[in-house]
Interface confidence: low
């Protein structure tokens, strides 16, 4: 089992935190403040390089061998013979030794690498590991902070479960290990469609056009879309569809809704002409090779109409139970206003007339109708 | 000892700017995580913006985003505040803060154990 | 963000007396969690951190306790310099925030 390196045995050593792949700088001072002779050394004795008194770096073997260390001539002069190792590997780990002026100082390297669990790119909802690798014998503690300023912290391996869009960006880990730091920076993608539902609030006959911003567009995958009208009990396909080199190709769709998709990201559905039958839920899902998104889509559906002598103004879709219906003339009193689907006014004025969908102090949707006589029917 | 000392403060229009700076001694600035916290007239404390030790990571509160600016020099040991299009609720003593850490069971946690004095930032016409 | 709410909002306490004061946060900061005090014209001063630990140089007198969401502050005795302004902080997720402070009054 390997022994943890203590405080106390690090008192007699200096400790240097590396990171895998970048350089670190390992010191060593003369009293003098002048140049001398020195040696670094592996702690088998094997000599790494050094300057033996005519001012030029000597290195211990080949350059093939060696060529990943240096030192910082223009240091000497003031006393300073540093170790500069480059391209740091997990196996730079161990104890250096400088030699100078009869002394011997020791420098320990504990070199570190925090990686992403597979991939950087990961699907809302799923779980990122960070795991630390750290040399026999630290015993470092770990800190990262996400894009939006969660902070989770462990030993080794750290997860986050359910990413979602705003873990996007750069994580920062913090090794600490003996009251010294080390700054690790990830780039972690969520791959997400950038709101989590949509709804649309239209009137009968217009058209409605659904859009579903990705936060990225370099993947490649199939989608549907799946529908289930208020009036109905189950789903049903509405469109499928793939996507290759950011292009969008229909693959089935329902005739009679003459659905169209745009050619181009981000994805958008357009509904040439809605009706009440088509108000209720629907289900976007995506297949990635990473996996699938989801993303719900509401349509909301209002209808006003004159039949014989009563004014009707009735919503299908998915409403939340505070929102209201209210019939009034334009620039009057409110009429009817209910919590509730369909109101109706019997023997209505004649003029413009308004029907609106509100939540609190906010219109949802407003739609006129002229009542021209009473008895007239019209949609 | 270690000592933060505030300055730049003063009286300013609202859409004015300012520029606070913290002047860091006794402690090796360039391995601490900086903070500034504000605190309106007779309010209470409201964190405004930190910045890691190398200056790579930064946060900002949601009311100054865009409009604030942290930065620091660590050869100068100073930490600064750009604040631009300056409010009349941005009114408070702004206070300089070390963020610092304990390790404790491989764990560490961060608080802020060192303050400034503050500076006064008043916004008025 | 994460909503801390101090109670009570002042506290009236002889000296010698023990003070005790509440936070609650509105999710939970795990053990992320400080105390402050702060007397007028001054900047605050750090009393607790990690919800339990006490700072260099504060009193034994001070002590704090919970995790989670519910926390407390207690002053076992308290002397006439403890009567100021106390504020409750988590540093789990940023924002970090404060509570609105708590005053602690002579009686």
């Known amino acids: 089992e390997q022994k943890l390196i203590s405080e106390e045995d690090l008192a007699a050593k200096t400790l240097v935190l590396g990171k895998e792949g970048e350089s670190a700088e390992l010191p060593c001072e003369s009293s003098q403040k002048k140049i001398t002779v020195f040696t670094w050394k592996f702690s088998d004795q094997r000599k790494i390089l050094g300057q033996h008194g005519k001012g030029v770096l000597i290195r211990g073997g080949s350059p093939s061998q060696f060529d990943r260390f240096d030192s910082k001539k223009g240091a000497w002069e003031k006393g300073s013979f540093p170790l500069i190792i480059n391209k740091l590997k997990m196996e730079d780990s161990q104890t250096y030794i400088c030699e100078l002026e009869n002394r011997k100082e020791e420098v320990e390297l504990w070199v570190f690498k925090v990686t992403a669990n597979s991939d950087t790119h990961l699907l809302q909802g799923q779980s990122l590991t960070l795991t630390l690798e750290s040399p026999p014998g630290s015993s470092p503690s770990v800190q990262c902070r996400s894009p939006r300023g969660k902070n989770i912290q462990g030993g080794k391996t750290l997860s986050v479960s359910q990413l979602e869009l705003q873990d996007s960006g750069t994580w920062t880990c913090t090794v600490l290990q003996n009251q010294k730091k080390v700054e690790f920076k990830i780039d972690i993608v969520v791959l997400a469609f950038q709101s989590t539902a949509i709804t649309a609030y239209k009137s009968e006959g217009e058209s409605a056009e659904f859009s579903f911003p990705l936060n990225f567009a370099e993947e490649n995958g199939w989608g549907e879309l799946m529908w289930k009208a208020e009036k109905d009990s189950f789903f049903q396909p509405w469109i499928s569809f793939s996507i290759k080199n950011k292009e969008v190709s229909v693959q089935k769709s329902t005739k009679d809704l003459k659905l169209q998709l745009k050619e181009t990201l981000p994805l958008t559905l357009k509904i040439p002409q809605v009706s009440l039958q088509f108000a209720g839920s629907g289900n976007l899902t995506l297949t990635l090779d990473k996996g699938t998104l989801h993303q719900e889509v509401n349509l909301v559906v209002m209808k006003v109409a004159q039949l014989n002598n009563t004014l009707t103004c009735e919503v299908m879709g998915p409403t939340s139970p505070k929102m209201r219906l209210t019939l009034k003339q334009e620039n009057q009193e409110a009429r009817v206003s209910e919590e509730q689907k369909v109101v109706q006014v019997v023997a209505p004025e004649t003029g413009l007339w308004q029907c609106l969908l509100s939540e609190g102090d906010k219109v949802k949707m407003d739609s006129r109708i002229q009542v021209l006589s009473r008895g007239v029917n019209q949609t | 000892q270690v000592q933060l000392v505030e300055s730049g403060g003063g009286l300013v229009k609202p859409g004015g700017s300012l520029r606070l700076s913290c002047a860091a001694s006794g402690f090796t600035f360039s391995d601490y995580y900086m903070n500034w916290i504000r605190q309106a007239p007779g309010k209470g404390l409201e964190w405004v913006s930190y910045i890691s030790s190398s200056g790579s990571t930064i946060f900002y509160t949601d009311s100054v985003k865009g409009r604030f600016t942290i930065s620091r020099d660590n050869a100068k040991n100073s930490l600064y505040l750009q604040m631009n299009s300056l409010r009349a609720e941005d009114t408070a003593v702004y206070y300089c803060a070390r963020e610092d850490y304990s390790n404790y069971e491989d764990y560490y946690y961060y608080y802020t154990g060192v303050w400034g004095k503050g500076t006064t930032v008043t916004v008025s016409s | 963000e994460i909503v801390m709410t101090q109670s009570p909002a002042a506290l009236s306490v002889s000296p010698g007396e023990r003070a005790t004061l509440s936070c609650r946060a509105s999710?939970?900061?795990?053990?992320?969690f400080a105390w402050y005090q702060q007397k007028p014209g001054q900047a605050p001063r750090l009393l607790i951190y990690n919800a339990s630990t006490r700072a260099t140089g504060i009193p034994a007198r001070f002590s704090g306790s919970g995790s989670g969401t519910e926390f407390t502050l207690t002053i076992s005795s308290l002397q006439s310099e403890d009567f100021a302004v106390y504020y409750c902080q988590q540093y789990n997720n940023w924002p970090y925030t404060f509570g609105q402070g708590t005053k602690l009054e002579i009686k």
């Open positions: 999710q939970s900061v795990s053990s992320k």
